[in-house]
């Protein structure tokens, strides 16, 4: 029996080279959010602590921006960014809630058309 609910942006797609906002929202609980961790599969991307603020993992500093809110913005997307992302909410007194987002990074439409159509 869980009290809260995590709402996420679900399955999303974005173009290579572009940006995307990963967003989760915890609802249906009065629990206090003490920290939110963002992970990409098995890597920690960022932490937002209620007292200490944001910390971005050094290996992602150039391409990850905090916010908006408790969300995360990924920039300069590559096809290697395709995969699962998790928002992990640590709350008191409820415990931990986890949301999942699947991101697919597509080749840009310009690149696709360039590959498909050749000018004679």
């Amino acid at each position: 029996m869980m009290t809260g609910t995590i709402e996420t942006t679900g399955n999303i797609s974005a173009e290579k080279g572009g940006s995307i906002i990963l967003q989760c929202h915890l609802s249906s609980t009065t629990a206090q959010v003490t920290q939110v961790n963002w992970e990409q599969q098995d890597q920690l991307l960022a932490i937002c602590n209620a007292d200490l603020g944001w910390h971005i993992s050094p290996s992602f500093k150039d391409r990850v921006a905090p916010g908006p809110g408790l969300g995360l913005t990924l920039q300069s997307l590559t096809v290697n960014d395709t995969g699962e992302y998790f928002c992990i909410y640590h709350t008191y007194p409820d415990g931990t809630y986890t949301g999942r987002i699947f991101l697919e990074v597509l080749e840009s439409s310009v690149a696709e058309h360039g590959a498909r159509f050749q000018i004679p």
Epitope: G4, N37, D42, P93, G95, T96
Partner: nanobody, 127 residues
Framework: EVQLVESGGGLVQPGGSLRLSCAAS????????RGWFRQAPGKGLEWVST???????????TYADSVRGRFTISRDNSKNTLYLQMNSLRAEDTAVYYC?????????????????WGQGTLVTVSS
């Protein structure tokens, strides 16, 4: 099939310490929700602590008010073992302690439904 086996219980004097262990087999997920519960003689099951861990490095522990500051939940990934370090033990901590694991990690806390349980280990605090 997931199997959980607790150990480390015993008789200890008030103010003493014990460390409980819970060895898991078949529980090899990248995200884990595990916890400790206890049942005192003649009483219902009581949540003690939960631990959410992920291979990405997230480590979130939560405690019941009655044990916060005295008990610490931890884990050893290499041994796939969960621990409960119990310090400053009191007579009211006397109970059978159970380790539990949850398959889904969408929620990990005192109100979560746990899928797998160990057989329990008895902790008696008495002088």
């Amino acid at each position: 099939e997931v199997q959980l086996v607790e150990s480390g219980g015993g008789l200890v004097q008030p103010g003493g310490s014990l460390r409980l262990s819970c060895a898991a087999s078949g529980y090899t997920y990248s995200r884990k929700c595990r916890g400790w519960f206890r049942q005192a003689p003649g009483k219902g099951l009581e949540w003690v602590s939960t631990l959410y861990t992920s291979s990405g490095g997230t480590y979130f522990d939560t405690y019941a008010d009655s044990v916060r500051g005295r008990f610490t939940i931890s884990r050893d990934n290499s041994k796939n073992t969960l621990y409960l370090q119990m310090n400053s033990l009191r007579a009211e901590d006397t109970a059978v302690y159970y380790c539990a694991a949850r398959l889904s990690t969408d929620f990990c806390g005192p109100r979560a439904d746990f899928d797998y349980w160990g057989q329990g280990t008895l902790v008696t605090v008495s002088s």
